[in-house]
Interface confidence: medium
């Protein structure tokens, strides 16, 4: 988790002088509770936005937006803590909006936004906005949280972001798998425009199960430049086992930008359909 490398993060708007600061996610008001605390944020919205760094790289970011409730507690609102928790790693990153002037009611509802948390493809986050100061231990909570799922690199807009392109998202191998006689599969795919090796991993499963009954790995050496974008054909030998009939073919490239962690593409061959057995015709017709 990190912040987009923007020049200066701003949270000021007409009628409010505000600065964005790094936060330890442990605001001072936890340790020194205040008697009067503001109410919670209203209408917290999280959306996927895209932003360029100063170097021109494009990253997915969490666009966080919320409004204030129209009650007198805004007189005690000193700022907000924004927290993003990546759910699979428990990594957390926080920033703090520090209000340098007192808020006053005006004719429009106060609205705040922040779009500088960089998020990763295919990850889920919990976004929390805490109004500051935080409540006393038994006080009403004054935060709002929402979960936010970032699409993977198959998503059209995500595909062209720097992290997705670095993991090989622009490569479309267009895998075809053909079943041959004598327990073999012919796998065909399009090579990318990089002189790097690939590996094909074949995993076979019984008809209705997810425990593999066979695995095979085939290495494809780095193509020469004249072979870029050409089709590569490989014949794989299957295990001669009647029930081991559903095959997943996975192609893993080793592009220089992602090495062992490039996006893998896969295709599946289902077990052959069992012909429906016709109902037996009885020798006699019952009379009732």
């Amino acid at each position: 988790l990190r912040l987009l490398d923007h020049r200066a993060l701003v949270c000021s708007q007409p009628g409010l002088n505000c600065t964005v600061k790094n936060s330890t996610c442990l605001d001072d008001s936890w340790i020194h509770p205040r008697n009067l605390t503001p109410s919670s944020p209203k209408d917290l919205q999280i959306q996927l936005h895209f932003a360029h760094t100063q170097q021109g790289d494009l990253f997915p970011v969490a666009h966080i937006e919320w409004t204030l409730q129209t009650d007198a507690s805004i007189l005690y609102l000193e700022g907000a803590e924004l927290s993003v928790l990546q759910l699979n790693t428990n990594e957390r990153l926080c920033v703090r909006f520090e209000f340098l002037s007192k808020l006053r009611h005006h004719h429009r509802r106060w609205r705040f936004t922040f779009s500088h948390f960089v998020v990763d493809p295919d990850q889920e986050y919990e976004v929390t906005v805490h109004h500051l100061p935080k409540p006393i231990p038994d006080g009403d909570p004054n935060h709002q949280s929402k979960n936010f799922l970032v699409p993977d690199c198959e998503h059209a807009r995500m595909k062209v972001t720097t992290p997705c392109m670095s993991s090989g998202s622009l490569w479309d191998p267009n895998i075809t798998v053909e079943t041959l006689e004598a327990h073999q599969l012919r796998v065909s795919f399009t090579l990318w425009n990089e002189s790097t090796h690939y590996q094909i991993l074949l995993t076979s499963f019984p008809h209705m199960e997810n425990h593999s009954c066979f695995e095979h790995m085939h290495h494809i050496p780095a193509p020469r430049p004249e072979e870029f974008h050409q089709r590569s054909n490989v014949t794989l030998t299957l295990r001669n086992l009647k029930g081991c009939c559903r095959h997943q073919v996975q192609i893993q490239p080793f592009f220089s930008s992602c090495l062992n962690d490039c996006l893998r593409h896969s295709a599946t061959v289902s077990c052959p359909e069992m012909p429906d057995t016709p109902e037996p015709i009885p020798d006699y017709m019952p009379l009732w």
Epitope: L201, S212, E215, M217
Partner: nanobody, 115 residues
Amino acid sequence: EVQLVESGGGLVQAGGSLKLSCAASGSTFRGAAMAWYRQAPGKQRDFVATIDSLGNTNYADSVKGRFTISRDNTENTMYLQMNSLKPEDTAVYYCNVPRFISRAWGQGTQVTVSS
């Protein structure tokens, strides 16, 4: 999760032989394809050879005819017999299960071929 421990490396003269072993723990070994990789100083980790549970093998062009990969499913062990070694075979050799390729690697075993 599979744990892999490589052994058998050492210093050998050009033209000599070594046999590497890879001991695997974890129930996924028996049906899994296994592979050897190597990483020379300052270079990317490269594929060497692979073997599936039926004994089907596949080799990098640079080692074909000189290296032989084998496995013992009952002992959960894979081997790499390296003959006619050349100085360019000097590297740290690693074993892995291709389906776990992006996970943590073992320590590897150092093979040094002197001329």
